[in-house]
């Protein structure tokens, strides 16, 4: 054996962010020499599951028929060939939505904003939470985090954007979460359409999509500017 076996590829279908009760399939793809595939979950001492490879032996399927809190977490997979075990795959973070009631997403002063001006997206939850996430549909990097610095829980988080450009236009949702498991998110807020006027092209409403929709290449990572709001929350860009 020349060196360590190449690591397999791990992914989830229809995506890695799954609503409570929905089904998800985790795939691990190795090589044609694989004899067994193993899926490990972080903090689980025993192999989380193991499967024979599907023909032609280069991948295995791990099915979750109904998503619950217990399945949310960080996974890695391995395969075993005649010469031993592979390196672990890159981690897959399986996130469940629907763990808490949905927050409300609004735009201040208005969801209709002129290019070059400022707007703040406000995500509000009924109960205090310590993490808020803003997602722009079809963005290449959809997650923006605002997380409490000292575990102090908040009812809301502000996502300021300044100056606004055409890139900021689109459909947004937000989620809230507790810090003890960032793999468990609330139900999504109702969508908010941010319309930026004064741009070269007319804004077109984006269709409502599930969070697990693959990122489109057309959108740049959303990077709101401006000062961090005085809410005890720290901004994290994912």
């Amino acid at each position: 054996q020349a060196g360590p076996l190449p690591k397999p590829t791990l992914w989830a279908e229809p995506g890695s962010v799954i609503s409570w009760g929905n089904s998800v399939t985790i795939w691990c793809q190795g090589t044609l020499e694989a004899r067994e595939y193993r899926l490990d979950k972080e903090e689980s001492p025993a192999p989380w599951d193991r499967q024979n490879p599907l023909e032609p032996k280069n991948k295995a399927r791990f099915s979750i028929p109904s998503m619950t809190e217990d399945y949310a977490g960080r996974y890695r997979c391995y395969y075993r060939s005649p010469v031993g075990w592979s390196q672990p795959s890159d981690p897959l973070e399986l996130v469940m939505t629907g763990a808490y009631s949905k927050p409300t997403l609004s735009a201040l002063p208005s969801p209709l904003v002129t290019s070059g001006k400022s707007v703040t997206l406000l995500c509000q939850s009924r109960s205090p939470m310590d993490t808020f996430l803003l997602i722009k549909e079809r963005a290449a990097h959809p997650l923006l985090h605002l997380r409490s610095e000292h575990g102090a829980q908040q009812h809301q988080a502000e996502f300021p954007m300044s100056p606004v450009t055409s890139v900021h236009g689109g459909t947004y949702r937000c989620f809230s979460s507790h810090g003890f498991s960032h793999y468990l998110l609330s139900h999504p807020s109702d969508p908010l359409e941010l319309i930026v006027s004064g741009s070269l092209e007319d804004p077109r409403p984006s269709p409502t999509r599930s969070v697990s929709t693959a990122a489109g290449p057309e959108d740049q990572p959303l990077m709101p500017t401006g000062s961090v709001p005085h809410s005890g929350l720290r901004r994290h860009w994912e």
């Epitope: 004899r35 067994e36 192999p47 989380w48 599951d49 217990d70 031993g84």
Partner: antibody
Framework: QVQLVQSGAEVKKPGASVKVSCKAS????????MHWVRQAPGQGLEWIGE????????NYNEKFKTRATLTVDTSTSTAYMELSSLRSEDTAVYYC?????????????????WGQGTLVTVSS | DIQMTQSPSSLSASVGDRVTITCRAS??????LNWYQQKPGKAPKLLIY???RLHSGVPSRFSGSGSGTDYTFTISSLQPEDIATYYC?????????FGGGTKVEIK
């Protein structure tokens, strides 16, 4: 010390179901998969299936997939094997057995502890 | 499923004899081969895993070797307490499968 204590002998009629229990002690129940193996009188060993007590994931021998159901109760560290639609050929000693990693190196797994066995007799 | 063929099905040997049992798999099992000892009326007991590794507490007179499809189990010096049936078992692919067993008796 590791112990797997199984329920007592059962006599069942053809078509009935049987549920065998296996109470584990002396180790962390959720850290090891539990296997079930049977042995007909004077015969060899036959694997039925396995269950991960930490999440309930199961794998079955195709031969038993439609008739065997493996479950666990983590609150009592007990594993169960239920076999339905019993026939005379199911008369056997049923064993639960702990499966886990043995060597320090990744991938050396085997059944290292067994229950004492439960005799299930299927007779009309 | 992988078929495991064990031979002989029974043997009789004297105390102190060297005893050898063979196990052949229907396909390459990459050394994922375990050996168990079962005494009458008792549950099986793990002796050797991964072809040649001695399980903790198992006497060193027991040993294993092999690769690919052909594997061997040896008792270097048979003792009265070794009277039992011995089973090989492959752990290379699901489902795990066992050999038919070899019954060892004292002459």
């Amino acid at each position: 010390q590791v112990q797997l204590v199984q329920s007592g002998a059962e006599v069942k009629k053809p078509g009935a179901s049987v549920k065998v229990s296996c109470k584990a002690s002396g180790y962390t129940f959720t850290n090891y998969w539990m296997h079930w193996v049977r042995q007909a009188p004077g015969q060899g060993l036959e694997w039925i299936g396995e269950i991960n007590p930490s999440n309930g994931r199961t794998n079955y021998n195709e031969k038993f997939k439609t008739r065997a159901t493996l479950t666990v109760d983590t609150s009592t560290s007990t594993a169960y094997m239920e076999l339905s639609s019993l026939r005379s050929e199911d008369t056997a000693v049923y064993y639960c057995a702990r499966w886990g990693q043995l060597g320090l190196r990744e991938g050396y797994y085997a059944v290292d502890y067994w229950g004492q066995g439960t005799l299930v007799t299927v007779s009309s | 499923d992988i078929q495991m063929t064990q031979s002989p099905s029974s043997l009789s040997a004297s105390v102190g004899d060297r005893v050898t049992i063979t196990c052949r798999a229907s396909q390459d099992i990459s050394n994922y081969l375990n050996w168990y000892q079962q005494k009458p009326g008792k549950a099986p007991k793990l002796l050797i895993y991964y072809t040649s590794r001695l399980h903790s507490g198992v006497p060193s007179r027991f040993s294993g070797s092999g690769s690919g499809t052909d594997y061997t189990f040896t008792i270097s010096s048979l003792q009265p307490e070794d009277i039992a049936t011995y089973y090989c078992q492959q752990g290379n692919t699901l489902p795990p499968t066992f050999g038919g067993g070899t019954k060892v008796e004292i002459k």
